[in-house]
């Protein structure tokens, strides 16, 4: 139960990340005009991976798309491309997490496939998450960057009375989404290796032994029986020489070859 | 249409207080960002207070700061503007104007005569 | 506040005439979010309230004679209107969009020569 419980888990918080990185590549507001120690103007400027904007305080909103491709900055154009891999890579891991969860039945499959899956959906939404967050953070740094660099120049070409002031950027809302959803696809991910632990069958290394006693035939693995994927023939899984009825979880939590640490 | 219509003018002493009022309709007042501008007898134009439209933001000019309150009900459809602590030099024509494209004042009303005088 | 200055004070012309009025402002209002110049012009006749002609420095209002053209950047800002008519006779402003408080220049009387 506790392994899927941890599987399901990790698939909504990973899926929750995956959906705030998408929202936060879509949003305008990864830098938003710097009010502080400003004079108060009456327009607010704000900018996204994709477009800028500017809202006039009469409640007017303008916005342009970035229509060139090469005279966009490096770093922009790396930001973007960290968080579409990052939703790229959240999304296939999303498609093959949802057949690798314990309570969907998808016809014969087996526990170790199931396993398998697991650990590469895992695998995808750590990659996904750390992409976004690295991505977000790029952006930050530019940020920080641009911002001590116009404080520096705040006021520059003050010929006699005429002052240019230099509109500063800080961090918008789409930063802190991005953060926040990086991390829990990141989270999502670690859930989903951990419950690949508990999903992974149990093995020993050597053969079952057939053991002939007169009068019975009866055969015993010492190994313990295969965990079910609760299909088809394999429904008494059961061993009937165990004292109690355990649970397919009970049974997996010991240690087999397929632990991954 | 757009119609913005202007009230609560009149004669008051200085030290005195008066409420301004202005009516709008045929456009969204509640999407609106709305000023005051006033106009002293043969003088030129002055913003005297505005307002965003959502109500979270006013700004004065130095000269009426701390004496003038703009507001706003956008149920009413309505700008006012409280005016205390009047001054001889707060005699004018107050104007109700919409902001529009560019912040710039696109509609005007016709004003209401505001005299502060002993 | 920001300050805005406008030149001259009064113009006489002669009806078909071009009239050129200057305007300029103490801090640049020009935004660079979208290379815009927050600057408006304004026509005001005796005893009506102003009208709108010019915003964003240069985009004429619907309704507008096409005479009326404005130009400039930053701090520097001129209305030009092409060939007077009778009606144009009025005086003109030109307000700051850009800073709070939103401040006019003190106006230019365009009178017939």
């Known amino acids: 139960m506790a392994v899927t419980a941890c599987q399901g888990l990790g698939f909504v918080v990973s899926l929750i990340g995956i959906a705030g990185i998408i929202a936060a590549t879509c949003m305008d507001q990864w830098s938003t005009q710097d009010l502080y120690n400003n004079p108060v103007t009456a327009v607010f400027n704000y900018q996204g991976l994709w477009r800028s904007c500017v809202r006039e305080s009469s409640g007017f909103t303008e916005c342009r798309g970035y229509f060139t491709l090469l005279g966009l900055p490096a770093m922009l154009q790396a930001v973007r491309a960290l968080m579409i891999v990052g939703i790229v890579l959240g999304a296939i891991g999303l498609l093959v997490s949802i057949f690798a969860l314990k309570c969907i039945r998808i016809g014969s499959m087996e526990d170790s496939a199931k396993a398998n899956m697991t650990l590469t959906s895992g695998i995808m939404f750590i990659v996904s998450g750390l992409c976004a967050i690295a991505g977000v953070s790029v952006f930050a740094n530019m940020l920080v960057t641009n911002f001590w660099m116009s404080t520096a120049n705040m006021y520059t070409g003050m010929g006699g009375m005429v002052q240019t002031v230099q509109t500063r950027y800080t961090f918008g809302a789409a930063l802190f989404v991005g953060w926040v959803a990086g991390g829990l696809t990141l989270i999502g991910g670690v859930m989903m290796c951990i419950a690949c632990r508990g999903l992974a069958p149990e093995e020993t290394n050597y053969k079952a032994v057939s053991y002939h006693a007169s009068g019975h035939s009866v055969a015993y693995k010492p190994g313990g029986f295969k965990a079910s994927t609760g299909f088809g023939s394999n429904t008494k899984n059961k061993k009937i020489y165990d004292g109690g009825a355990r649970t397919e979880d009970e049974v997996q939590s010991y240690p087999s070859k397929h632990d991954y640490v | 249409e757009v119609q913005l219509v202007e009230s609560g003018g009149g004669l008051v002493k200085p030290g005195g207080s008066l409420r301004l009022s202005c009516a709008a309709s045929g456009f969204s007042f509640s999407n609106s960002a709305m000023s005051w501008v006033r106009q002293a007898p043969g003088k030129g134009l002055e913003g005297v207070a505005t307002i965003s439209s959502g109500d979270s933001y006013t700004y004065y000019p130095d000269s009426v700061k701390g004496r003038f309150t703009i507001s706003r009900d956008n149920a009413k459809n309505s700008l006012y503007l409280q005016m205390n602590s009047l001054r001889a030099e707060d005699t004018a024509v107050y104007y109700c104007?919409?902001?529009?494209?560019?912040?710039?004042?696109?509609?005007w009303g016709q004003g209401t005569l505001v005299t502060v005088s002993s | 506040d920001i300050v805005m200055t406008q030149s001259p004070d009064s113009l006489a012309v002669s009806l078909g005439e071009r009239a050129t009025i200057n305007c300029k402002s103490s801090?640049?209002?020009?935004?660079?979010?979208?290379?815009?110049?927050?600057l408006t012009w304004y026509q005001q006749k005796p005893g009506q309230p102003p009208k709108l002609l010019i915003y964003w420095s240069s985009t004429r209002e619907s309704g507008v004679p096409d005479r009326f053209s404005g130009s400039g950047s930053g701090t520097d800002f001129t209305l030009t209107i092409s060939s007077l008519q009778a009606e144009d006779f009025a005086v003109y402003y030109c307000?700051?969009?850009?800073?709070?408080?939103?401040?006019f220049g003190g106006g230019t009387k365009v009178e017939i020569k």
């Open positions: 801090q640049s209002l020009l935004n660079s979010g979208n290379q815009k110049n927050y």
């Open positions: 307000q700051n969009d850009y800073y709070y408080p939103l401040t």
């Open positions: 104007a919409r902001q529009g494209y560019g912040n710039a004042l696109d509609y």
